[in-house]
Interface confidence: medium
């Protein structure tokens, strides 16, 4: 029995152009959390047994709000270790999957929305009881720095935590703090005492008095970051002047692995370790299955009978996206009519209607004309939450109470003269024109270009508009 422990040191934009400024979407603040998944062996696990060694979820990190114009920072992280207990022997070889998740905290009814920001996969050999192993991985435009170790718990000891150390009732012949182990009758196991001052976080020892540094650290006590040491971890030909290695291009520069795959150098080439759901030389081919639990927010996963076939997420109401990871903005469809205000309550839509309208979608026009009369034979027309009068000819104004001059707008064309009449207006047309508004020219031979004058009316005679 024992515990696998993962410590996230930093998560932030990777180096180079195009790095994201913020993990949050435009909708507002967010916070991060991490999920770790362990699988035994170095080969890809079958779809039916994900996280067979165990999985753990971190606490939520502090709320992050993007600061405009500020440099993109390392993001605030959850406190503490991620711990994955294991009951049986530690396998020694394992696959480690670390997922970085974003929880959006904008004004979202029905709770925050989650989305996967980054996923890294490492296949590793690791003995239990050893020092912290440190790693830096890129996932797309993001960079994750972390350390991990496996340690035995209770009375288990050894690189696989399989040997039991049973305290004996008889006093031990070993010194204080040393554990007598049953299989080793007169021997004791104890961690060696490292050189005084050796960094607890970045150094370790296998022999008493030594101080060996984890990757990324240097100096006699492992307190100097490697980036400040001029000769640490560089590739390429040796420089005659400094004796240091001069950097040269490596096959993993620029990270050729897509979809969050991590790159390892091989002689003259590279190898991509792909996260679950992706495969191919550069992790460019997707193969996520339902056994990975890819559908969020209560979604249902449907795949073929073949475990390696593609999947489809059936999303519950209010969610969309290939993984049901997006909250539907149902108000974007503008379901409220007549200028109503749309409110998405998560479980339902609500329309707040303007005055004069009602109904679930503000589709009902209330009777704006009730109790309102239009004078002088005008008729009331509903619309826009207020009444409007369509007035009889010769009247105008909101309630048709004002007498209107039908000739004020000069309705008679081509010099025709306008006469007010009890039922409207009459145009007396100038010679050569005819029509109710004198709009039609008359041909010189007396034949009109458009409808002939009705019987009893000659072109040029006044015509009453009926």
């Amino acid at each position: 029995a024992g515990v696998f422990e993962l410590q996230i040191h930093s998560f932030g934009p990777g180096p180079g152009p195009g790095a994201p400024r913020s993990p949050c979407s435009a909708r507002g603040p967010c916070r991060l959390f991490f999920r770790v998944c362990l699988k035994p062996g170095l080969s890809e696990e079958a779809a039916e047994s994900p996280c067979a060694l165990g999985a753990a979820l971190s606490a939520r990190g502090p709320v992050y709000t993007e600061q405009p114009e500020a440099p993109a920072p390392d993001l605030p992280l959850p406190n503490g270790l991620l711990q994955v207990p294991f009951r049986d022997a530690w396998p020694g070889t394992f696959s480690l999957i670390i997922e970085t998740w974003r929880e959006e905290l904008g004004d979202q009814i029905g709770g925050p929305a989650w989305s996967l920001l980054a996923r890294v996969t490492r296949r590793r050999r690791l003995a239990a009881g050893g020092p912290w192993a440190r790693d830096i991985q890129r996932a797309g435009a993001w960079e994750l720095r972390f350390s991990y170790r496996a340690r035995c718990e209770l009375l288990a000891v050894g690189t696989a935590c399989t040997r039991l150390c049973r305290p004996r009732s008889a006093p031990s012949r070993c010194g204080p703090g040393l554990r007598p182990c049953a299989p080793l009758e007169d021997e004791c196991e104890a961690p060696p005492v490292c050189r005084a001052g050796c960094s607890l976080e970045h150094g370790f020892c296998e022999q008493p008095g030594e101080c060996r540094c984890l990757e990324g650290w240097t100096g006699p006590l492992c307190t100097v970051p490697a980036s400040t040491s001029s000769c640490l971890g560089l590739r390429g030909p040796s420089s005659a002047t400094t004796g240091c290695l001069v950097p040269g291009p490596g096959p993993c520069d620029g990270n050729p692995c897509a979809n969050g795959g991590s790159c390892s150098e091989t002689p003259g080439s590279f190898e991509c370790t792909c996260p679950r759901g992706f495969y191919g030389l550069r992790c460019e081919v997707s193969g996520v299955t339902c056994a990975d639990g890819p559908c969020f927010n209560g979604g249902l996963c449907v795949g073929g009978a073949d475990p390696d076939s593609a999947y489809i997420c059936h999303c519950p109401p209010g969610f969309q996206g290939s993984n049901c990871e997006k909250r539907v903005d149902r108000c974007s469809l503008q379901p409220c009519r007549n200028g109503g205000l749309c409110l998405d309550l998560g479980h339902a839509l609500r329309c707040r209607c303007r005055a004069g309208f009602a109904g679930p979608r503000c589709e009902h026009n209330l009777d704006d004309c009730a109790g309102r009369a239009c004078a002088n034979g005008g008729t009331c027309v509903e619309g826009g939450g207020a009444h409007r009068c369509s007035c009889a000819l010769g009247f105008g104004g909101r309630d048709c109470r004002e007498r209107a001059d039908p000739c004020a707008a000069r309705p008679c064309a081509h010099g025709g003269r306008c006469y007010a009449h009890f039922s409207g207006l009459v145009c007396a047309c100038a010679p050569g024109y005819m029509g109710s508004r004198c709009e039609f020219p008359v041909h010189p031979d007396g034949v009109s270009a458009l409808p002939a004058a009705p019987p009893g009316l000659r072109p040029g005679d006044p015509q009453r508009y009926l």
Epitope: C37, S49, P50, G111, C290, C295, G299, L300, C301
Partner: nanobody, 130 residues
Framework: QVRLVESGGGSVQAGGSLRLSCETS????????MAWFRQAPGKEREGVAS????????YYADSVKGRFTISQDNAKNTVYLQMDSLKPEDTAMYYC???????????????????????WGQGTQVTVSS
């Protein structure tokens, strides 16, 4: 249309047994976490047991450990809840639910909460009298 159909509820004396069944389609059955919940009058709906039919260990709430057993029949796309040594406090409406989880997450108390599940059966009533 997602379909989860429960059956097997009924009335029984304390100490007796019942077996509930939840049948669904082959695709939903094989690809999702299947869980049993129960809701007693005036109480919250609580997770009782869960299983990922494609593999993985089952999960049981502390209140039913040792008395209830969740099992499956792959040929019938059905998940069962065998309820033995029933107590009056087991009286409730029992619901079958399904959702996408990884196998590991299906077997956790934090995973088997009502808010995580969007697809439910219509429920079957279990009444235990003393």
């Amino acid at each position: 249309q997602v379909r989860l159909v429960e059956s097997g509820g009924g009335s029984v004396q304390a100490g007796g047994s019942l077996r509930l069944s939840c049948e669904t389609s082959r695709y939903i059955y094989g690809n999702n976490c299947m869980a049993w919940f129960r809701q007693a009058p005036g109480k919250e709906r609580e997770g009782v047991a869960s299983i990922y039919p494609a593999g993985g260990r089952p999960y049981y709430a502390d209140s039913v450990k040792g008395r209830f057993t969740i099992s499956q029949d792959n040929a019938k796309n059905t998940v069962y809840l065998q309820m033995d040594s029933l107590k009056p406090e087991d009286t409730a409406m029992y619901y079958c639910a399904a959702r996408s989880f990884s196998i590991a997450d299906c077997a956790t108390q934090s995973g088997i909460t009502r808010s995580n599940f969007a697809y439910w059966g219509q429920g079957t009533q279990v009444t235990v009298s003393s």
